[in-house]
């Protein structure tokens, strides 16, 4: 049954689908923004380097209490090979400046529609 | 919110030299494509120069190249343009921007103004 099991469970999400998937999680965030995302919290901003994405789940993991952007932080963490939690500081962010969650939401997009652009799923 | 704070501008004669500087603040600006526009007294704005989110892709106006250099650094949030060979008809109030083409993504700065004059 163990052997079994395997062959019912997917397989890995292969790396496009994945990213695909995030864009249009951060599209719905961005279009379906109502009042100020997170209540205007702010977030430090990131480098845009080989650890992006963890970067980016450092940044947006000490938002709490905001709904809107848990599914973001979730599968952000598919991408991200370590583990990530609040209050990390990692040198991928670029230190005294923050941002609005919102501005960082939409600019982390724009970043991501030009890797799957490029062909970078990774 | 996001902002673009040009300097460097000023007075200088034809043939001198000018650096212009854009401090970018409140948004990832090294996901940006960047670049400068200039309006001249009574004239419609024109594009100058822009430059690639990494900085290794540049474009030139004809009426520029050859003279301006576009440059950013990125751990600076920083834009710039060198300018030589000024001519007077350089003259005009010279805005940092951005350069995207996805809509919701245009931003500018308010602007510094470069005067060519002997």
């Known amino acids: 049954l163990t052997c079994l099991g395997g062959f019912a469970s997917p397989g890995p999400v292969p790396p496009s689908t994945a990213l695909r998937e995030l864009i249009e999680e951060l599209v719905n965030i961005t279009q379906n923004q109502k009042a100020p995302l997170c209540n205007g919290s702010m977030v430090w901003s990131i480098n845009l380097t080989a650890g992006m994405y963890c970067a980016a789940l450092e940044s947006l993991i000490n938002v709490s209490g905001c709904s809107a952007i848990e599914k973001t932080q979730r599968m952000l963490s598919g991408f991200c090979p370590h583990k990530v939690s609040a209050g990390q500081f990692s040198s991928l962010h670029v230190r005294d400046t923050k941002i609005e969650v919102a501005q960082f939401v939409k600019d982390l997009l724009l970043h991501l529609k030009k890797l799957f652009r490029e062909g970078q799923f990774n | 919110g996001v902002q673009l704070l040009e300097s460097g501008g000023g007075l200088v004669q034809p043939g001198g030299s000018l650096r212009l500087s854009c401090a970018a603040s409140?948004?990832?600006?090294?996901?940006?494509?960047m670049g400068w526009a200039r309006q001249a007294p009574g004239k419609g704005l024109e594009w100058v120069s822009s430059i690639n989110d990494g900085g290794n892709v540049t474009y030139y106006a004809d009426s520029v190249k050859g003279r301006f250099t576009i440059s950013r650094d990125n751990s600076k949030n920083t834009l710039y343009l060198q300018m030589n060979s000024l001519r007077a008809e350089d003259t005009a109030v010279y805005y940092c921007?951005?350069?995207?083409?996805?809509?919701?993504?245009?931003?500018r700065g308010q602007g510094t103004l470069v005067t060519v004059s002997s």
């Open positions: 409140g948004f990832i600006f090294a996901v940006y494509d």
């Open positions: 921007a951005t350069a995207e083409d996805e809509p919701g993504y245009d931003y």
